[in-house]
């Protein structure tokens, strides 16, 4: 009889040397091959003989080593959720969604199932950049110095104050974190006592 | 021990039906995969129709729409259920499971008018 | 449907000789999935090589498969008065599963 270094093999203890890859399989005491991505399990192992497996049909995936004896069902992004999709749906892979922009993800369940609309950052504020879009609601924070955003938006970004001088202008009025510099043209007229020389 | 048992078998004429039964024993029907294969006489094997494990079934070109395989829980049971029989229906009816590891002694289906 | 080949038809051989069956697909066999079985008069099949290469336990090892893609063998060393019979392939890489026609191992 063949040496056991591939399953099937006996297991004692309930475990297996491939956790990933293989399965202890309890009717019979042995530790079996997991289907790879993409597939499942057509024929489970038995005493005399290994797991067969077989692809998953189109508009169905299994996405890990697996001893399931079906796929999973591809499901679409559901627009209504607030989700779009990012990467179709393959054998190995479930459909990527994310939430549609100007939207946060509100329910999560190992993946995102609902989004709702970010809330509006009053002026004066922005959102306060996430490392993942959609991941949760805005977080307003205020404009940093020299900084100003004049409207209610979920997505709107404090801009910099203009500076009057880049544009040959003077300052009228400074800029505050809702409103944005007020420049004006200079003065043309002398200073009066420059006029009087002027006239003699 | 696994032990697979064929019966239905028999003499039919063109055009009719028949079911054939497996009885299995040592195993879980239900759970595994299951196939059918024939032999005509004198001839070579032949893939009938096979259930797997998920319940997906399949079947060959030959039989395909005529022939319905399935499996009774209760019983431990696989069926082929065979309607519009033909003269090159004729054969030993194999019963094998789990996968192709255990064969039943098979069951003659004659077609015959 | 993958069509499966064997040859030779039959092959004439001597006890304690060995020798290599051949069992050609029409296209590459998914995942080498490929059984040979051995049927002998009067009896049922027996599975006794899977996955083109793995052994059924129980199966003496003077069986052994081997091939990928379209091409696979399975060769008896030291061959035994009870090896003499008909041997066959199978692909089961598809949900059509074919067998090829066969292969009788004579007495010389």
């Known amino acids: 009889s063949q040496p056991q270094a591939v399953p099937p093999y006996a297991s004692e203890n309930q475990t297996c040397r491939d956790q990933e890859k293989e399965y202890y399989e309890p009717q019979h005491r042995i530790c079996c091959s997991r289907c790879p991505p993409g597939t499942y399990v057509s024929a489970k192992c038995s005493r005399i003989r290994d797991t067969v497996c077989a692809t998953c049909a189109e508009n169905s995936y299994n996405e890990h080593w697996n001893y399931l004896t079906i796929c999973q069902l591809c499901r679409p992004c559901d627009p209504v959720m607030g989700l779009e999709e990012i990467a179709p749906c393959t054998s190995k892979r479930k459909t990527q969604c994310r939430c549609q922009p100007g939207m946060f993800c509100a329910a999560w369940a190992l993946e995102c199932t609902h989004c709702e609309l970010l809330s509006d950052c009053p002026p004066g504020t922005e959102a306060e950049l996430k490392d993942e879009v959609g991941k949760g609601n805005n977080h307003c924070v205020p404009c940093k110095a020299g900084h100003f955003q004049n409207t209610s938006s979920p997505s709107a970004r404090c801009q910099p104050h203009t500076r009057c001088e880049n544009q040959g202008l003077v300052e009228a009025a400074p800029g505050t974190a809702q409103s944005d510099t007020t420049c004006k043209n200079p003065l043309e007229p002398l200073p009066p006592e420059m006029s009087g020389t002027m006239l003699m | 021990e696994v032990q697979l048992v064929e019966s239905g078998g028999g003499l039919i004429q063109p055009g009719g039906s028949l079911r054939l039964s497996c009885a299995a024993s040592g195993f879980t029907v239900s759970d595994n995969y299951m196939s059918w294969v024939r032999q005509a006489p004198g001839k070579g094997l032949e893939w009938v129709s096979v259930?797997?494990?998920?319940?997906?079934?399949y079947y060959g070109d030959s039989v395909k729409g005529r022939f319905t395989i399935s499996r009774d829980n209760s019983k431990n049971t696989l069926y082929l259920q065979m309607n519009s029989l033909r003269a090159e229906d004729t054969a030993v009816y194999f019963c094998t499971g789990p996968f192709f590891d255990y064969w039943g002694p098979g069951t003659l289906v004659t077609v015959s008018s | 449907e993958i069509v499966l080949t064997q040859f030779p038809g039959t092959l004439s051989l001597s006890p304690g000789e060995g020798g290599t069956l051949s069992c050609r697909a029409s296209q590459t066999v998914w995942s080498n999935y490929l059984a040979w079985y051995q049927q002998k008069p009067g009896q049922a099949p027996r599975l006794l090589i899977y996955?083109?290469?793995r052994r059924v336990i129980g199966i003496p090892d003077r069986f052994s498969g081997s091939g990928s893609g379209t091409d696979f063998n399975l060769t008896i060393s030291s061959l035994e008065p009870g090896d003499f019979a008909v041997y066959y392939c199978?692909?089961?890489?598809?949900?059509?599963?074919?067998f090829g026609q066969g292969t009788r191992l004579e007495i010389k």
């Open positions: 996955g083109a290469s």
């Open positions: 259930i797997y494990s998920g319940g997906n079934t």
């Open positions: 199978q692909q089961y890489g598809s949900s059509s599963i074919t």
